[in-house]
Interface confidence: low
């Protein structure tokens, strides 16, 4: 089995990931591994010479680049925050800040926007991946309520008055909790059956 550099008449190389075709000499040469770049190009008698990327630069893939890519910070103005630092083999990993979703995507997220509020009586449908899309608000299921306008508030179960030794004064709705009262407390005048003489 030939070791780079080797002649190639059909302009293809055996290992597409780790080799590339060099048209000037019509040969297959080694690519440089992740974290490195080409410091000297290959020739018919010498294979590619690779060097390690300098600090604050990277190359993610097997490559024949003569430079490393500059590490870029996550831009907080665009609503991004860092989840993993840049290394010689990987660019800075960013995600949308809490309460935001990715509004523009080009191989990676370029900027995030604030999640829409879900109105009272609803909650944001849970997604597989946080930050991938805007909120889709769904109604609270039966026996639950949510009483704020918020991008992240969850519907809570209605209070069960009997669990607290109380009785129900007013039933809960999708937007409000059950109102409980002491069983010994009289009903307010407008709710009692008193007759005026």
């Amino acid at each position: 089995q030939a070791v780079p550099p080797y002649a190639s008449e059909n302009q293809t190389c055996r290992d597409q990931e780790k080799e590339y075709y060099e048209p000037q000499h019509r040969i297959c040469c080694s690519r440089c591994p992740p974290g490195t770049y080409v410091s000297a190009k290959c020739s018919r008698i010498r294979d590619t010479v690779c060097a390690t990327c300098a600090e604050n630069s990277y190359n993610e893939h097997w490559n024949y680049l003569t430079i490393c890519q500059l590490c870029r910070p996550c831009d907080p103005v665009m609503g991004l925050e860092e989840i993993a630092p840049c290394t010689s083999k990987r660019k800075t990993q960013c995600r949308c800040q809490p309460g935001m979703f990715c509004a523009a995507w080009a191989l990676e997220c370029t900027h995030c926007e604030l999640l829409s509020d879900c109105p009272p009586g609803t909650e944001a449908e849970l997604k597989d991946e946080v930050g991938k899309g805007n909120n889709h608000c769904v109604p609270c299921k039966a026996g639950h309520f949510q009483n704020t306008s918020s991008p992240s508030a969850r519907c809570q179960p209605h209070t069960r008055c009997e669990n607290q030794g109380l009785v129900e004064a007013a039933p809960g709705t999708a937007q409000s909790d059950t109102t409980c009262k002491n069983p010994l407390e009289p009903l307010p005048p407008e709710m009692s059956g008193t007759m005026l003489m």
């Epitope: 103005v77 609503g79 509004a103 523009a104 995507w105 900027h111 926007e113 604030l114």
Partner: nanobody, 112 residues
């Protein structure tokens, strides 16, 4: 469904300027982020600039300082002001809503 119509392309000399427009219909315009992409002959489509609903902008390093993206919510239109144009800016320019909607594009040719 969202319809996008780009216009404003043409032939311009190096160093010249053009203003591209993207008119959107069939969507609540102010609720959408928009971006301008370009595709040069034989190359992949690349993102050039984006603008969020709040007006936050992002530019690719190749156009930063030369191109300006803006939006007019009243006119349902996104613009790309392109100054100091170079031959390598030659491409078909497309606008996009980041939800799979593409227009037909407008050709920009920078040549002397």
């Amino acid at each position: 469904d969202v319809q996008l119509v780009e216009s404003g392309g043409g032939l311009v000399q190096p160093g010249g300027s053009l203003r591209l427009s993207c008119k959107a219909s069939g969507t609540t315009f102010s609720d959408r982020a928009f971006g301008w992409y370009r595709q040069a002959p034989g190359k992949q489509r690349e993102l050039v600039a984006t603008i969020s609903t709040a007006g936050l902008t992002w530019y690719d390093v190749s156009v930063k300082g030369r191109f300006t993206i803006s939006r007019d919510n009243a006119k349902n239109t996104v613009y790309l002001q392109m100054n100091s144009l170079r031959p390598e800016d030659t491409a078909v320019y497309y606008c996009n809503t980041f939800r799979g909607n593409w227009g037909q594009g407008t050709l920009v040719t920078v040549s002397s």
